[in-house]
């Protein structure tokens, strides 16, 4: 279908600033260093291409992207389909994150990317000091005490954990937006499926300990589970496809060369095998060490302790794809019922994984919900 | 329930050769990845060779060069082909296989390289 590529988006070689600039928009970057180091690039969209007049306060949104991806998600489309451009011209404040160890996020203070040690954490360590440095530093830096979360994917992953471990935290956020949600994996039909029997020591001696690329592990399964099914063969190389699934009919093919050349941005082995940990316990729990010695010198326990959405009081709204294979309907709707504060649900059933952040209908499907209900809550 | 069988390991010279075979019961084509682990006296188990359904393969950096893993799925059997044997190859060798219902281990072959 799309054997070959014909890279006609400028794009494809630009940082998030200049994709930002490239359509006309206001960006500012900065960053921030977390508590242990890591300095992650954010980018801001004060306000959009024909509202810059507007004074006073505007709501505050930040979008945070999910596994195996960057900042680059929420802008990677034409912008009257990039969720970042529409809430900027729907005269929001727009805040893009980045997780440790993507493209844009790969620096530390004390340890080279090269190193070992730069690339030993998982979306724990995502949750526990990327997610409160982040919201930290808007806060101070827009003077507005809360601000709104978009999450997708990995992206709500982090925000379950933060948001109902850290209380202080969980107060500076309005509503937190969940698209494509992730807590336990038990159901996921992702590739990651196929890890989730690898021991620890195989999993490190087949993909290293340090960035993560798919090797060619995943080969075996792609003739037949992925790209004979969609024949897409530009996509069956790239690990954000091959592991959050995609589907033709929603894409916009003529932004494929942005989304291959941005993507995937990069995650620590550690985070994937913690993955495939979640997926073999069918839990939604915290990193296991390995051994109940080394659990106890981390978290003074022999198990890794359970991550409790219960606990989570922001109000929620949740949207769900029918064929997303790693957010599988099941597994949010085991997640559904724990949620004490969900304020809107909203399942679509021909949707993947990929679909909530570049499918065509995306405004249609998700976006303006977002805008709206941003909207009332300023009322 | 896949079960695993090693056999050929022995005691060689340094320099010498040898050619451990793993027999599985069932069919290893199920398998995505089959590994050769080793443990050294006094030493934790640790992978020295794998090879994954795709026929690619990786190896610990001190075998590279000197070991083979390969597998012939009609006879359900994995090899591990260990030329210029060192001392330090010395251990019990255990064949391995990861599929979709779990992570299977043989019993173990003693393999002795003497000085």
């Known amino acids: 279908l799309f054997g070959k590529l014909h890279p006609g988006s400028p794009e494809v070689t630009m940082n998030i600033s200049q994709m930002i600039t490239y359509w006309g928009y206001p960006n500012e970057e900065y960053e921030v260093v977390t508590e242990d180091g890591y300095i992650l690039e954010v980018n801001r969209i004060p306000y959009g291409k024909k509202n810059s007049g507007n004074t006073g306060q505007r709501p505050v949104v930040f979008l945070q992207h999910g596994l195996l991806a960057s900042a680059t998600n929420w802008i990677s489309n034409l912008p009257n389909n990039s969720l970042a451009f529409i809430l900027a011209d729907a005269g929001y404040d727009v805040w893009l994150g980045n997780s440790r160890g993507n493209t844009w996020a790969r620096r530390n203070l004390y340890y080279s990317p090269d190193s070992v040690e730069f690339w030993a954490f998982s979306f724990d360590e995502m949750a526990k000091y990327d997610l409160p440095a982040t919201i930290d530093f808007i806060v101070k830096k827009t003077g507005q005490k809360q601000l709104h979360y978009v999450g997708h994917s990995q992206g709500t992953t982090i925000g379950f954990i933060a948001f109902s471990t850290n209380p202080s935290l969980a107060k500076r956020i309005k509503t937190f937006y969940a698209l494509a949600p992730v807590a336990t994996v038990k159901y996921t039909k992702s590739l990651i499926n196929k890890l989730r029997f690898v021991p620890q020591s195989l999993f490190k001696f087949i993909f290293g300990d340090k960035i993560f690329y798919p090797h060619n592990f995943f080969d075996q399964f792609l003739a037949t589970e992925v790209c004979s099914r969609e024949m897409l063969n530009l996509l069956c190389s790239n690990a954000l496809f091959i592991i959050c699934g995609f589907d033709s009919k929603n894409f916009n093919t003529s932004r494929l060369d942005v989304y291959l050349s941005h993507n995937p941005a990069g995650t620590s082995v550690q985070n994937m095998f913690h993955w495939t940990q979640a997926v073999k316990s069918g839990k939604f729990q915290a990193y296991d060490w390995g051994s109940p010695v080394q659990n106890r010198m981390h978290y003074d326990q022999s198990q890794p302790p359970y991550y409790n959405v219960t606990a989570m009081n922001v109000p929620i709204a949740v949207w769900n794809g029918g064929k997303d294979l790693l957010a599988d309907p099941q597994d949010v709707g085991l997640l559904l019922p724990k949620l004490p504060n969900l304020i809107y649900h909203k399942e679509i059933p021909f949707y993947n994984h990929l679909d909530f952040i570049w499918a065509m209908d995306a405004p249609q499907e998700v976006y303006n919900d977002i805008v709206s209900m941003i909207s009332e809550d300023k009322k | 329930q896949v079960q695993l069988q090693e056999s050929g390991g022995g005691l060689v010279q340094a320099g010498g050769s040898l050619r451990l075979s793993c027999a599985a019961s069932?069919?290893?084509?199920?398998?995505?990845?089959m590994s050769w682990y080793r443990q050294a006296p006094g030493k934790q188990r640790e992978p020295v060779a794998a090879l994954m359904g795709s026929g690619s393969t990786t190896y610990a950096d001190s075998v590279k060069g000197r070991f083979t893993i390969s597998r012939d799925n009609i006879k359900n059997t994995m090899y591990l082909q260990m030329n210029s044997l060192k001392p330090e190859d010395t251990g019990v060798y255990y064949c391995?296989?990861?599929?979709?219902?779990?992570?299977?281990w043989g019993q173990g072959t003693q393999v002795t390289v003497s000085s």
């Open positions: 069932g069919s290893i084509g199920s398998l995505y990845v």
């Open positions: 391995a296989g990861t599929g979709a219902e779990g992570h299977y």
